[in-house]
């Protein structure tokens, strides 16, 4: 069965700024990623940013920095400053299509008491919901 | 309700320039991605251009160098500069909203662009 | 670029008959497609979104199918106000590109 992990981090560097990593373990060729925080994209989660392997990255404040790690991972940087700046108990969340399979999604959140530049390693989330 | 209204067509001479406006309402600009497409007399449809909702812009080959699409969030407003015009450019021009990536779902009414001596 | 071949260019149809229309990709789009019907003088107007999805408010007699490089449009029971040009819109990869256009005319 596919999952996705979820990896948030704080930067050190910038105590308000956070890198989330996605993966997508399954077999299936990617179609689209969409990144939320506040919960899961369409359940009152708020898009950060919209990856397609062909056309291209979307993102939106606060996001600074979306890319492709792999074909079956994301990274995206969060900026840390101003009123839509996440906190240390935000939720992330990433759900990643691939055709024809279907739909795949789970949430993380910076890990309780971690210390700045340190995160949990990537082991899959929970699997929220596949469509 | 959502809305799209172009303005700006006209007749223009060959090598002449035009811009295009397209005011939009009813829907949170910012969020979307905007095209413009085009329609030659009793011709088919063309994709002309997009721009994402950071500015990030593409464009049908034979329009890269003379066409230049631009957005004002602010202003809930979509442009397209039109230089170097030519015959084959005259269309109906349509101003298109997307939810990126999936696909055209609104459009405006059109605005008559004429490249003619 | 992705072509996109639109089969038949027109036909004739009458009132409740069932009506198919095919376009067919140059490479595989997934079901990154659109149907598009437009009337004379108006903008065009969605009809199905990703490939099989009805737009909201459009009559369920419509349905798309496919996936890959083969899609099909449907109109189960032809209305009178269904006569119009109908377009396949590919939204995988730039450029973006139209089928042809089928015209369906009555008979």
């Known amino acids: 069965t596919p999952e996705v992990w979820v990896q948030v981090r704080m930067e050190a560097t910038e105590l308000s700024s956070f890198t989330i990593r996605c993966g997508f373990l399954g077999s299936g060729s990617i179609s689209l990623v969409t990144v939320s925080w506040g919960g899961p994209n369409g359940a009152g989660g708020t898009t950060l940013a919209v990856l397609h392997p062909e056309r291209g990255i979307r993102q939106w404040a606060p996001a600074r920095q979306a890319r492709w790690e792999t074909q079956s991972s994301i990274s995206l940087i969060l900026e840390g400053s101003g009123a839509s700046s996440p906190c240390a108990n935000t939720t992330f969340c990433c759900k990643f299509a691939s055709f024809p399979e279907g739909s795949w999604e789970a949430c993380g959140s910076l890990p309780p008491s971690s210390d700045p530049g340190l995160s949990a390693p990537p082991t899959p989330a929970p699997i929220l919901r596949a469509d | 309700e959502v809305q799209l209204v172009e303005s700006g067509g006209g007749l223009v001479q060959p090598g002449g320039s035009l811009r295009l406006s397209c005011a939009a309402s009813g829907f949170t600009f910012r969020n979307y991605d905007m095209h413009w497409v085009r329609q030659a007399p009793g011709k088919g449809l063309e994709w002309v251009s997009d721009?994402?909702?950071?500015?990030?812009?593409y464009y049908l080959g034979s329009v890269k160098g003379r066409f230049t699409i631009s957005r004002e969030n602010a202003k809930n407003s979509l442009y397209l500069q039109m230089n170097s015009l030519r015959a084959g450019d005259t269309a109906v021009y349509y101003c298109?909203?997307?939810?990126?990536?999936?696909?055209?779902?609104?459009w405006g009414q059109g605005t008559t662009v004429t490249v003619s001596s | 670029d992705i072509q996109m071949t639109q089969s038949p260019s027109s036909l004739s149809a009458s009132v409740g008959d069932r009506v198919t229309i095919t376009c067919r990709a140059s490479?595989?789009?997934?079901?990154?497609l659109g149907w598009y019907q437009q009337k004379p003088g108006k903008a065009p107007k969605r009809l199905i979104y990703a490939a099989s999805s009805l737009q909201s408010g459009v009559p369920s007699r419509f349905s798309g199918s496919g996936s890959g490089t083969e899609f099909t449009l449907t109109i189960s029971s032809l209305q009178p106000e269904d006569f119009a040009t109908y377009y396949c819109l590919q939204h995988n990869s730039y450029p973006l590109t139209f089928g042809g256009g089928t015209k369906v005319e009555i008979k």
């Open positions: 721009i994402g909702n950071s500015g990030e812009t």
């Open positions: 298109v909203r997307e939810e990126f990536p999936h696909g055209m779902d609104v």
């Open positions: 490479q595989g789009i997934r079901n990154d």
